[in-house]
């Protein structure tokens, strides 16, 4: 039976959102970007038990096949089911222009 | 720099469709599932190691991010970037029918 | 909603060459467990199982004639191809393509006639 | 190939009343797996084969409930519960245990 959002794990420890700080020398973009200098970086992490916010149908595959053949394939991974579009200030060739980002923050979170 | 589809870890290491021949027993389908009675399931396996297949944006701040907190920030995963339809034939309250699922089998993999 | 056609030269002469297309809609021969197959019915008779072509593009002929039969697919377009080589009297009938998932036969054409006469 | 027997005509039916039409196989078409591969179509006058029952005894979905089939691996039965004019046509069984799949020759149904 799926059990949705309820983590076995106990609270917290399941695939959900998370807030990582970052600085531009963290991710490697202080020769590209001048703004922001520090970004609040949602991302994905935790555990995805069995049928925990399971993606879709391969993902419940997975999750089966996992239990029977754990050395061979692996459990679902906690990744983004979305994203927030994000504001990037940096340099070109012709100067500084704003770039918008759809990939780079997580929004929700799935197991796949 | 991307290092693409080229893996540091030798080759089939990385990230990249495998087939994992499973039963509707082993699915736990057999109670609505009548055919296929096997299925060659292609799902992504594998290591996501720096850049390798990043799926965008997200997963190259990932990479930055497990490098520099790896015990908070995981690696990349390997998932399906697309799939594959299969059809199922399946037992329904009305008598048998043919379903499609557009989300069962993975037809090629990324990292994120 | 599955529909398939056939289409077909209608009469031939014998020792012709019959080509048969099948164009169908409502569904994809690049869908894993999908195929497409070949019967045919002679006038006031029973149906004869001829070929047929799976997704992956395995194909199986029915051995008392695959020595005639070539079965082929367009993907793309959504189309079935059948040869049968050097057709005589006893071809003539009335020729079915109908859509496979596994062992489920559940959509066939409306059928297309050969009459073969010298 | 697998042959498949059916007489050519059932006995006169009256509408409203129940009616039979058997089939036999040369060889018994239950796989190991349990399931019989055999198959039940009606092609009513002027029109195409259509299916009515699925792997012996599993109604096609849409098939009106006054259609059932039962039988052993070899003997087979197809029963109409209560006639009406629209099941007139020819019965056909067919077996997929072995290939080229092959069909009975089929029944008519014949009302009085």
């Known amino acids: 039976a799926r059990n949705g959002d309820h983590c076995p794990l106990g609270p917290g420890r399941c695939c959900r959102l998370h807030t990582v700080r970052a600085s531009l020398e963290d991710l490697g973009w202080a020769d590209w970007v001048l703004s922001p200098r520090e970004v609040q970086v949602t991302m994905c992490i935790g555990a995805c038990p069995s049928q925990f916010r399971a993606a879709n149908m391969h993902a419940q595959i997975k999750t089966s096949l996992h239990r029977l053949k754990p050395d061979t394939v692996p459990a679902p991974c906690c990744v983004p089911a979305s994203y927030n579009p994000m504001v990037l200030i940096q340099k070109t060739d012709t100067g500084v222009s704003l770039q918008t980002y759809d990939d780079l923050l997580a929004k929700d979170c799935h197991c796949i | 720099a991307r290092n693409g589809d080229h893996c540091p870890l030798g080759p089939g290491r990385c990230c990249r469709l495998h087939t994992v021949r499973a039963s509707l027993e082993d699915l736990g389908w057999a109670d609505w599932v009548l055919s296929p009675r096997e299925v060659q399931v292609t799902m992504c396996i594998g290591a996501c190691p720096s850049q390798f297949r990043a799926a965008n944006m997200h997963a190259q701040i990932k990479t930055s991010l497990h490098r520099l907190k790896p015990d908070t920030v995981p690696a990349p995963c390997c998932v399906p970037a697309s799939y594959n339809p299969m059809v199922l034939i399946q037992k329904t309250d009305t008598g048998v029918s043919l379903q499609t699922y557009d989300d069962l089998l993975a037809k090629d993999c990324h990292c994120i | 909603q599955v529909t398939l056609k056939e289409s077909g030269p209608g009469i031939l002469q014998p020792s012709q060459t019959l080509s048969l297309t099948c164009s169908f809609s409502?569904?994809?021969?690049?869908?894993?467990?999908?195929?497409v197959g070949w019967i045919r019915q002679p006038s006031g008779k029973g149906l004869e199982w001829l070929a047929h072509?799976?997704?992956?593009?395995?194909?199986y002929y029915n051995t008392a004639l695959k020595s005639r039969l070539t079965i082929s697919k367009d993907t793309s377009n959504n189309q079935v191809f059948l040869k049968i080589a050097s057709v005589d009297t006893a071809d003539t009938a009335t020729y079915y393509c109908?859509?496979?998932?596994?062992?489920?036969?559940?959509?066939w054409g409306q059928g297309t006639t050969l009459t073969v006469s010298s | 190939d697998i042959v498949m027997t059916q007489a050519a005509f059932s006995n006169p039916v009256t509408l409203g009343t129940s009616a039979s039409i058997s089939c036999r196989s040369s060889?018994?078409?239950?796989?190991?797996?349990?399931?019989?591969?055999l198959y039940w179509y009606l092609q009513k006058p002027g029109q195409s084969p259509q299916l009515l029952i699925y792997?012996?005894?599993n109604l096609v979905s849409g098939v009106p409930d006054r259609f059932s089939s039962s039988g052993s691996g070899t003997d087979f039965t197809l029963r109409i519960s209560r006639v009406e004019a629209e099941d007139v046509g020819v019965y056909y069984c067919?077996?997929?245990?072995?290939?080229?799949?092959?069909f009975g020759a089929g029944t008519k149904l014949e009302l009085k």
């Open positions: 060889k018994s078409l239950l796989h190991s797996n349990g399931i019989t591969y």
């Open positions: 409502g569904f994809s021969l690049s869908t894993y467990g999908i195929g």
């Open positions: 067919a077996q997929n245990l072995e290939l080229p799949p092959t």
């Open positions: 792997q012996m005894s």
């Open positions: 072509i799976w997704w992956n593009d395995n194909k």
């Open positions: 109908a859509r496979l998932a596994y062992d489920y036969v559940d959509s």
